[in-house]
């Protein structure tokens, strides 16, 4: 969790943090679920992808997301999942050439087809939270996290360090 200094001191640096290299340092293929074990699924509808948060039937296969990890030049704080003292950012891709994007104007999370280099809206600071959970903070809007709202992914503003453990911004990663 964040230290006493809270979100503000840490997130100020996100505005001017840049990715160390244009190449990810590593990638991981995982299913993404909420703190309450609902699955994040992706459906192709009318040539675009929709993102859903739903309970899957017992033997239903979970959708996988490719997490690409990038080093930021900015040092990590206590909560960031850092490597060699550097903050980690991730992009999330459920299928080739599509990435999750933060739409800060609409407070929404969308899937967009795009080419590399990816825009800043596709990058999220990775935070390792308690109980093997992670959270994703917008690079373009510090203090704003991917969260769950009305069975959809949305962008949720977190005002204080106490709210960082709120369940609707916590996610679980698993290989199954």
């Amino acid at each position: 969790a964040f230290g006493i200094s809270g979100v503000q001191k840490y997130t100020r640096a996100l505005h001017d943090s840049s990715i160390t290299g244009i190449s990810p340092i590593t990638e991981y293929l995982a299913s993404l679920s909420t703190y309450n074990d609902q699955s994040i699924t992706f459906a192709l509808e009318d040539e675009s992808y929709e993102i859903y948060v739903e309970d899957l039937k017992k033997d239903e296969k979970k959708d996988k997301v490719l997490l690409s990890y990038y080093e930021s030049q900015h040092p990590s704080n206590e909560s960031g999942d850092g490597v060699d003292g550097k903050m980690l950012m991730v992009t999330l891709s459920p299928t080739k050439d599509f990435w999750l994007h933060a739409n800060n104007k609409e407070h929404s999370v969308e899937l967009h087809k795009c080419e590399k280099p990816l825009p800043d809206q596709a990058f999220f600071v990775l935070h390792n939270m308690h109980s093997n959970c992670v959270s994703f903070e917008c690079k373009t809007d510090p203090g704003v996290f991917i969260g769950v709202k009305d069975n959809h992914l949305a962008l949720i503003k977190v005002d204080s360090s106490e709210n960082l453990c709120t369940e609707n911004i916590l996610f679980k990663l698993s290989e199954t």
Epitope: S23, T26, E27, L66, Y69, V83, E175
Partner: antibody, heavy 128, light 108 residues
Framework: QVQLQESGPGLVKPSETLSLTCTVS??????????WGWIRQPPGKGLEWIGS???????YYNPSLKSRVTISVDTSKNQFSLMLTSVTAADTAVYYC????????????????????WGNGTTVTVSS | EIVLTQSPGTLSLSPGERATLSCRAS???????LAWYQQKPGQAPRLLIY???SRATGIPDRFSGSGSGTDFTLTISRLEPKDFAVYYC?????????FGGGTKVEIK
């Protein structure tokens, strides 16, 4: 800073099984975003990837060695291991363990790896 | 599998000179997933460059990588005495990952 150290017998008889262990210090295998792997280098020759593993136990092997190789992980000991069966003189090499970045190829749905932290290496000679 | 050919096999240069090492792939790959390693006698390889052009942690900026498709280059802008070693390229665009045969940079 993560460090890796190989251990195991330096001499193995032909047709027997080569077993090596890599101990990771300065970081937890379980909490790492990285993969772990084995590479070998025959005397005076180049490098050959043997295989890689994620802390969950998911493995990735070089097809040329796949039938003889098993890589396993023990997160409680912060170690991962290599077993190579039916060894011959051609398996004589310096064996390195390494931390690896794994990158995914959507086209053939496979992972490939580069190694960013290496152990010092251990020499294994196959001889009777 | 992708075959990597490094040239020249040996490069004889003096300290302070610029070294240019080439790595050519048998097939083009779009990802630029190419790494460069340095290996000194009796030591393990050390990662210099990943993603064709990103320097690994702690690598001095005299080392730079470039290239795409099938042709990649490692440049050492001003050779220091400790830079004389064997250099390997490695692709990780496709499994199995493969290494080049190496280029030895020796003191002239």
């Amino acid at each position: 800073q993560v460090q890796l150290q190989e251990s195991g017998p330096g001499l193995v008889k032909p047709s027997e099984t080569l077993s090596l262990t890599c101990t990771v210090s300065g970081g937890s295998i379980r909490s790492s975003i990285f993969y772990w792997g084995w590479i070998r280098q025959p005397p005076g020759k180049g490098l050959e990837w043997i295989g890689s593993i994620y802390y969950s136990g998911r493995t990735y092997y070089n097809p040329s060695l796949k039938s003889r190789v098993t890589i396993s992980v023990d997160t409680s000991k912060n170690q991962f291991s290599l077993m190579l069966t039916s060894v011959t003189a051609a398996d004589t090499a310096v064996y390195y363990c390494a931390r690896a970045g794994g990158l995914y190829n959507w086209n053939d749905e496979s992972f490939s790896f580069y190694m960013d932290v290496w152990g010092n290496g251990t020499t294994v000679t196959v001889s009777s | 599998e992708i075959v990597l050919t490094q040239s020249p096999g040996t490069l004889s240069l003096s300290p302070g000179e610029r070294a240019t090492l080439s790595c050519r792939a048998s097939q083009s790959f779009s990802s630029s997933y190419l790494a460069w390693y340095q290996q000194k006698p009796g030591q393990a390889p050390r990662l210099l460059i990943y993603g064709a052009s990103s320097r690994a942690t702690g690598i001095p900026d005299r080392f730079s990588g470039s290239g795409s498709g099938t042709d990649f280059t490692l440049t050492i802008s001003r050779l220091e005495p400790k830079d004389f070693a064997v250099y390997y390229c490695q692709q990780y665009d496709r499994s199995p990952l493969t290494f080049g045969g190496g280029t030895k940079v020796e003191i002239k």
